[in-house]
Interface confidence: low
């Protein structure tokens, strides 16, 4: 699997969405996990409903948002109010018992404000940061990583 | 023998500012993910920031994220714990621990070092 | 984030005596899950990792198991030198949580 590769301005809110094949993963819950060095297990961050009927509801970890449409074959993972140290390597993962199948690996990368490389004359509208789904960044690119993913827990 | 050794703490008004300094010796610095965690008087712990052996990724706690910041130089051996906006609830312990071969298990431990924040 | 319930919170116990302290957490954690020894003064030690698995110089009575949501530390006969608090903490998830430790204490 290439790792995708998303930026996101610190502050703001960042959206992952993860595909993957709806009748294959039928049944099964999805999970985003974070990767702490370059071994050892995938630390869930969060994970969908417990009854999978009711995946598409959003569960929530301090600042990290999931939600499943089991139909469309798309798991979303959002990371609110994003800071530099949520810049790391992630995955998306289909949970089937105590296995776990990777669907994506991502790399979040944390970008400063820009108003902190302009001149103080300057005036900036901040963005509207109320409402669940504003100020998203979905800048994404794909690029092969060197890292490696063990199992996880 | 693996040996850690917190420095830094110290008495602090709310809002004001501390860096605590862990120096590390007996293994290969570089190899290993480092911790902070904190014990606040009385209480249990808590993990606060984590930092891969390279220094490039970097993992806080909901209750420090945007005021603490970790960092390491592998040259000089050293763990850093930049506390800013310091409020009453982050007068602990702090202690630097080894994180052994990525896991987030704390194989070694220094001794500690408080942390008052008080006016 | 996870949350780590210990019980007993106190267990008064004589030396020779066995310690069994319980973990629970609020979901699976799998099998990672440590425990630790702390006594007054002084940083935590690490005894189990992995639930089970006896960190480096950790004597033989003291022994981790279970797995996912219930865990146990059992102390085969206490020591003198074992009187203190025990956490346990999980890295399944993250952040990383402590128990709220249970105090073992001379009866």
């Known amino acids: 699997l290439n790792t995708t590769v998303l930026q996101g301005m610190a502050g703001q809110s960042l959206r992952v969405s993860c595909t993957y094949d709806a009748l294959k993963h039928w049944g099964r819950r999805k999970a985003w996990c974070r990767q702490l060095g370059e071994e050892g297990p995938c630390q869930r961050v969060v994970s969908t409903h417990g009854v999978w009927l009711l995946a598409f509801l959003k569960k929530r970890n301090g600042s990290t948002v999931i939600a499943d449409d089991t139909l469309a074959g798309t798991v979303t993972i959002t990371l609110k109010n994003l800071q530099a140290g949520d810049a790391g390597l992630y995955q998306c993962q289909s949970l089937r018992g105590r296995e776990a199948e990777v669907l994506q690996k991502v790399l979040v990368e944390v970008l400063e404000d820009p108003l902190d490389d302009q001149d103080a004359g300057d005036l900036w509208v901040p963005e509207e940061s109320s409402s669940f789904e504003g100020a998203q960044v979905e800048h994404s690119t794909s690029r092969n990583q060197e890292t490696s993913f063990p199992p996880t827990s | 023998e693996v040996q850690l050794l917190e420095s830094g703490g110290g008495l602090v008004q709310p809002g004001g500012s501390l860096r605590l300094s862990c120096a590390a010796s007996?293994?290969?610095?570089?190899?290993?993910?480092m911790s902070w965690v904190r014990q606040a008087p009385g209480k249990g712990l808590e993990w606060v920031s984590a930092?891969?052996?390279?220094?490039?990724?970097?993992y806080y706690a909901d209750s420090v994220k945007g005021r603490f910041t970790i960092s390491r130089d592998n040259s000089k051996n050293t763990l850093y714990l930049q506390m800013n906006s310091l409020r009453a609830e982050d007068t602990a312990v702090y202690y630097c621990?080894?994180?052994?071969?990525?896991?987030?298990?704390?194989?070694?431990w220094g001794q500690g070092t408080l942390v008052t924040v008080s006016s | 984030e996870i949350v780590l319930t210990q019980s007993p919170a106190t267990l008064s116990l004589s030396p020779g005596e066995r310690a069994t302290l319980s973990c629970r957490a609020s979901?699976?954690?799998?099998?990672?899950l440590a425990w630790y020894q702390q006594k007054p003064g002084q940083a935590p030690r690490l005894l189990i990792y992995?639930?089970?698995n006896r960190a480096t110089g950790i004597p033989a009575r003291f022994s981790g198991s279970g797995s996912g949501t219930d865990f146990t530390l059992t102390i085969s006969s206490l020591e003198p030198e074992d009187f203190a608090v025990y956490y346990c903490?999980?890295?399944?998830?993250?952040?990383?949580?402590f128990g709220g430790g249970t105090k073992v204490e001379i009866k």
């Open positions: 621990a080894r994180v052994p071969k990525h896991y987030v298990v704390l194989d070694y």
């Open positions: 007996g293994f290969t610095f570089s190899s290993y993910a």
């Open positions: 930092i891969s052996g390279s220094g490039g990724s970097t």
């Open positions: 979901q699976s954690v799998s099998s990672y």
């Open positions: 992995d639930a089970s």
């Open positions: 903490q999980q890295y399944s998830f993250f952040p990383p949580t």
